[in-house]
Amino acid sequence: LTCLGGFASPGPVPPSTALRELIEELVNITQNQKAPLCNGSMVWSINLTAGMYCAALESLINVSGCSAIEKTQRMLSGFCPHKVSAGQFSSLHVRDTKIEVAQFVKDLLLHLKKLFREGQFN
C-alpha cells in the first residue's frame, strides 16, 4: 500500500483487509476527484469518535445517484452493526453543520489515518 506508507500500523498485527480496502477507496475518491464530488451534495458532519462508522454511513446513505461513493456506502455497512436507513440519525450526530461530500470523505480519511498512527487497530 504505497499510498499508506507514511502511516503503517505500528503493531505487529496488520489491519483487517476490510479496513485497508475502505481506506484505499477513500484515498481513490480523493485522488481521482475531478468535478465536484456528488455534484457538491451536502451531508451532515459527524462526531468522529465513538460510533463513527455508523454515523458516517447514516450521513452518506442520504446521498443518492452518486456512483463515486456507492462502494464506500457498501463498505461502511460492513463496519456498522446496525441497520441504517436514509433519514435515520443516531444521537452521535452533530447535526448542526452540513459539509460537502468531498470534505466529509477527506475528514473521514484523515481520522482513519490518525487512528492508525495511534495504533487503535487490532
Partner: antibody, heavy 117, light 104 residues
Amino acid sequence: QVQLVQSGGGVVQPGRSLRLSCAASGFTFSSYGMHWVRQAPGKGLEWVAIIWYDGSNKYYADSVKGRFTISRDNSKNTLYLQMNSLRAEDTAVYYCARLWFGDLDAFDIWGQGTMVT
Amino acid sequence: EIVLTQSPATLSLSPGERATLSCRASQSVSSYLAWYQQKPGQAPRLLIYDASNRATGIPARFSGSGSGTDFTLTISSLEPEDFAVYYCHQRSSWPPIFTFGPGT
C-alpha cells in the same frame, strides 16, 4: 418494555455442547447489533462475541474463537450462542446485551444472565 | 491488545462523599470508553458512553471525563444505592474487539 430474556444455561460436562438463547422484546431487534458477555464466578466481565443486525458479520474473543458461534433469528427476535467443546474455564454467567444504537462501544440493554457450569 | 487498568481496586467511602475512579488504557483509545455499574446478582448497567456522555436515566451525579489513555468516573455525592462494582470498557477501532477493566 425493552427487555432481553435469557434461557438455556445449566450444568454440562467438559467437551460437551450447550446453546444459550436470548429473546428480545420492546424494540426492533432486527435493527440492532447484539453481543454476548460473560462473567466467571467472583471475576470481572469478559466480552465474548458480537453479531451484526442481519448476521452478516460476527467477531469473537480469542478465548472462544473456533468453539463458540453467535447467531440470530430475526423472525423470532432471538439471539443464540452455540457453545461447543466446553471447558472448565467457560464456567460463568452469560449475558446477552444490545449494542447502543449508532455506536460500537456501549451496551445499553442487558439480559438477566444465565449460569453455565 | 489494549489493556485497561482500574484504580483503586477498592474504594472505601461513605454516603455523601465524592468518589473518583480511574481507568487507564495501555494505549490511546481516543474516546471509545464506557462505564458500567454492577450490583451483586444483577446485570451491569450502562452509565457513561463515549467517555463523557451519560446514558438515558443516569443521575447527574455521575460524570465521565478523559481521552486518550486516562479516564475518570466521578460520583459527586454518593447515594446508598451507588455502592457497587464499576467497570470501564473499550473497543478497538477495528476489528471490534472489546475489553473490560478489572473493576473498582
